[in-house]
């Protein structure tokens, strides 16, 4: 049995909806039958969306259970519990999770443009880098116009000396589309931030 | 740069209806709720409910519940409050605003509602 | 529906001079609070969210503090342009309710 926490984007944007989800894998198909039970901070709910098994390519069957959480819930620190019953188990397996403790601490942003020795290439790099987070759970995408791109890399947070956590986000764009004067913004989610979101932008400055 | 922009005044007779748009630019419409707030002399500041654009889903302030109409165009980042069976006390100032985790970062820059005959 | 008691409902005060205007919830709402500011003919302006994080671009004079059902915001040193009408919100329950506000003079 696997818990999963939310995607960091979902609990981060106030229209998603974050789910827990419940995993249990290798299960006979000759005992199918798992029940999922949820609680949180030990308080039984009955608002979870149980999938029917799948069948895996090794002929066992996976089961998976979503839980849709409230934003605040997660964030606060709240301990969401999956207990799975099974005719295959001697007992009941009990999965916990939580968000990390400790006291949030929004990132500083800030964008780079391409180093003028990369302007021989036909690609060039955009940086974001993003540093001085807590805890490392963030979500970072790039925006071109408004537009969000795809054709960028975030590196894993890596923890600081200070304890708290960096990454660089590097976005790959055509010489002639920098060229262009176009904006470039990095967009950045994470818990210490005002309303979980900040972002930066830069463009090409002609003579630079 | 975000903006909430909402239409200009509006005079109506008692009984009427009326729709007042929010138009938001500067950020992904879909990713904040949009709330909305009544503003009259007599009572302050009163908050009449949200609505999901990503969604549709809203919520209302009990009071307001068959007074607020909330819909969204997400084609054109169009948020819509609809007013309707109009009295003297729905005369107000009525804002939008853009609702995130925390309240109201953006307000439009407000729509004075008089209901008279 | 929680009841946000807010006072002074107005007072004056002198250039420099520290304030204090302060809001009393009905029950505990979490520091899920919020206060903004007002001026005439204008939409209301966040300055403190979450009972005490201030708003990027608002000046430090601002500050906000409390907990459980007692918050207060405090502006260490006044100037000319923080007159207008000062709001309370608590957003720990739906309905969202604002404090009757703050009408804030300059003496």
């Known amino acids: 049995v696997f818990i999963f926490p939310p995607k960091t984007k979902d609990v981060l944007t106030i229209t998603l909806t974050p789910k827990v989800t419940c995993v249990v894998v290798d299960i006979s198909q000759n005992d199918p039958e798992v029940r999922f039970s949820w609680f949180i901070d030990d308080v039984e709910v009955h608002t979870a969306q149980t999938h029917a098994p799948e069948k895996q390519s090794n002929s066992t069957l996976r089961s998976v259970s979503e839980l849709p959480i409230v934003h605040r819930d997660w964030l606060n620190g709240k301990t969401f519990k999956c207990k799975v019953n099974s005719g295959a188990f001697p007992a009941p397996i009990e999965k916990s999770i939580s968000k990390p403790e400790g006291t949030p601490r929004g990132p500083q942003v800030y964008t780079m443009a391409p180093p003028k020795e990369e302007m021989t290439q036909s690609q060039v790099s955009i940086t974001c880098m993003v540093k001085g987070f807590y805890p490392p759970d963030i979500y970072t995408e790039w925006k071109m116009n408004g537009q969000p791109q795809e054709n960028y890399k975030n590196t894993p947070p890596t923890m600081d000396t200070d304890g708290s956590y960096f990454l660089y986000s590097k976005l790959n764009v055509k010489k002639e589309t920098w060229q262009q004067g176009n904006t470039f913004t990095c967009s950045v989610l994470h818990e210490g931030l005002h309303n979980h979101h900040t972002e930066k932008s830069l463009s090409h400055s002609p003579g630079k | 740069e975000v903006q909430l922009l909402q239409s200009g005044p509006e005079l109506v007779k008692p009984g009427a209806s009326v729709k007042i748009p929010c138009k938001a630019s500067?950020?992904?419409?879909?990713?904040?709720?949009m709330d909305w707030v009544k503003q009259s002399h007599e009572k302050s500041l009163e908050w009449i409910g949200y609505i999901n654009p990503y969604s549709g889903d809203t919520i209302y302030n009990h009071k307001f519940k068959d007074k607020a109409t909330l819909t969204v165009d997400k084609s054109s980042n169009i948020a819509y409050m609809e007013l309707r069976s109009l009295t003297s006390e729905d005369t107000a100032v009525y804002y939008c605003a853009r609702g995130g985790y925390d309240y109201g970062d953006h307000w439009g820059q407000g729509t004075t509602l008089t209901v008279s005959s | 529906d929680i009841k946000m008691t807010q006072s002074p409902s107005s007072m004056y005060a002198s250039l420099g001079e520290r304030v204090t205007i302060t809001c009393k919830a009905s029950?505990?709402?979490?520091?899920?609070l919020s206060w903004f500011q007002q001026k005439p003919g204008k939409s209301p302006k966040t300055l403190i969210y979450?009972?005490?994080r201030l708003v990027d671009g608002v000046p430090s004079r601002f500050s906000g503090s409390g907990s459980g059902q007692d918050y207060s915001l405090t502006i260490s040193s006044l100037e000319y342009e923080d007159m207008g009408i000062y709001y309370c919100l608590q957003d720990d329950e739906f309905p969202r309710t604002f404090g009757g506000g703050t009408k804030l003079e300059i003496k």
């Open positions: 979450r009972a005490n």
């Open positions: 029950q505990d709402i979490n520091s899920y």
């Open positions: 500067g950020y992904t419409f879909t990713d904040y709720n």
